[in-house]
């Protein structure tokens, strides 16, 4: 019986909802990959619960996750990156729930960084550039980026532009004059790998110049 919960505890445990979700990050620390899982119900009592991944691993049967507050985490080089792994929530030796997951389909890229906006007076446009660590990676190199911008006063009125490069041009006439704008960017895998949007980059703020052309008109957003 060692390693098992008390019978009463297990009966209670089986009434709970142990649904969980996971995401992988490849080459997140040099050649190391990571896998992060968390329960969907924030009220689950995680005291005796562990996560284990088995299958689709290099020269080991299974790996145990480390618990970091509410999340469970593995950092390893031992993902085969093909086929499905069995990820289980366990109490001692008993599996409460398991999911078969292909780690290449739950990839969450790292957030873009170094977002900046430069105004070109002669061209009457704004050049948006940003960087991504994925340009240097072996695996998740091809990403789709989502650039979102809004006038600071428009709380939820974001305009989104999808692009595959790390450079975008915004025409001045498409923006309101003499306005403060907030812009941010995120990424998602776009070739071979599948998964989720990254976190947003830190926002960048820029001001559009006042109108000084003869017509005094600018196109609305």
């Amino acid at each position: 019986e060692s390693g098992y919960a008390q019978n009463g505890d297990l009966e209670d445990a089986e009434l709970d909802d142990y649904s969980f979700s996971c995401y992988s990050q490849l080459e997140v620390n040099g050649s190391q990959h990571s896998l992060t899982c968390a329960f969907e119900d924030p009220d689950v009592n995680i005291t005796n619960l562990e996560f284990e991944i088995c299958g689709a691993l290099v020269e080991v049967k299974c790996l145990n996750f480390r618990k970091l507050q509410e999340i469970y985490f593995i950092e390893t080089k031992k993902f085969l990156l093909i086929g499905k792994s069995n990820i289980c929530v366990k109490v001692g030796e008993k599996s409460l729930t398991c999911k078969k997951i292909d780690l290449t389909t739950i990839v969450k890229p790292e957030a873009p960084f170094d977002l900046s906006v430069v105004y070109r007076e002669g061209a009457n446009d704004f050049v948006v550039t940003f960087n991504t660590s994925h340009l240097q990676k072996k695996y998740v190199k091809v990403l789709m980026h989502d650039v979102a911008y809004r006038q600071e006063k428009d709380e939820n009125k974001w305009t989104h532009v999808n692009l595959s490069s790390t450079k975008l041009t915004l025409l001045q006439r498409k923006l309101q004059p003499a306005a403060m704008y907030e812009i941010k960017v995120r990424s998602i895998p776009d070739h071979y790998f599948k998964g989720f949007w990254s976190e947003w980059s830190p926002s960048y703020y820029f001001r559009t110049p006042e109108i000084n052309n003869s017509s005094g008109e600018m196109d609305p957003i």
Partner: antibody, heavy 119, light 105 residues
């Protein structure tokens, strides 16, 4: 149809190396693992290792680690198994076999390559 | 490393009879697969993940079991079923059992 065609029989001396090829056709080569399994005369099956053709990542049976090297050439959809420092007990039929990564079983096998190690 | 022990080593039966082949693991296994091999041929998959029939395999073959004990059943032997059968664990190092030979009585 899905097919794995292996190179022909080999006769080697003890201490030598052998390299067996396995040409895949009829499916996306990089979408499945390639396993290598051997069978000594009158004996059972022994898993040697596998390669993920997409990225070249390998996983070896500890029994063969250091003696077996798995590689692939995705441009010609071919996997290779090289076994070094051959001994007489390496005499066997060597199979390449496609691995279904959804269920981790071997669903398509090559015809086998007989390797004889004899002085 | 898990050891898979198949029993019996040889099973002597007549066509039409029921064959029950056993595979016992030295510690718990999540999934088990079964293969058939005829003399001079490569193995072919029969059952994967304990009980799922591989492509083209007739319904007289079935698999069951959990934990450490798994069974392959052939409900009514046909002449082409006389062969050697191997079980294999789903996870590294993908160990095979020693095999059970089903021969004509």
């Amino acid at each position: 149809q899905v097919q794995l065609v292996q190179s022909g029989a080999e006769v080697k001396k003890p201490g030598a190396s052998v390299k067996v090829s396995c040409k895949a056709s009829g499916y996306t080569f990089t979408g499945y693992t390639m396993n290598w399994v051997r069978q000594a005369p009158g004996q059972g099956l022994e898993w040697m290792g596998l390669i993920n053709p997409y990225n070249g990542v390998t996983s070896y049976n500890q029994k063969f680690k250091g003696r077996v090297t798995l590689t692939r050439d995705t441009s010609i959809s071919t996997a290779y198994m090289e076994l070094s420092r051959l001994r007489s007990d390496d005499t066997a039929v060597y199979y390449c076999a496609r691995g279904d990564g959804n269920y981790w079983y071997v669903d398509v096998w090559g015809q086998g390559t007989t390797v004889t190690v004899s002085s | 490393e898990i050891v898979l022990t198949q029993s019996p080593a040889t099973l002597s039966l007549s066509p039409g009879e029921r064959a029950t082949l056993s595979c016992s693991a030295s510690s718990s296994v999540t999934y088990m697969h079964w293969y058939q091999q005829k003399p001079g041929q490569a193995p072919r998959p029969l059952i994967y993940e304990i009980s799922k029939l591989a492509s083209g395999i007739p319904a007289r073959f079935s698999g069951s079991g959990s934990g450490t004990d798994f069974t392959l059943t052939i409900s009514s032997l046909e002449p082409e079923d006389f062969a050697v059968y191997y079980c294999q664990e789903w996870n590294y190092p993908y160990t095979f059992g020693g095999g059970t030979k089903v021969e004509i009585k």
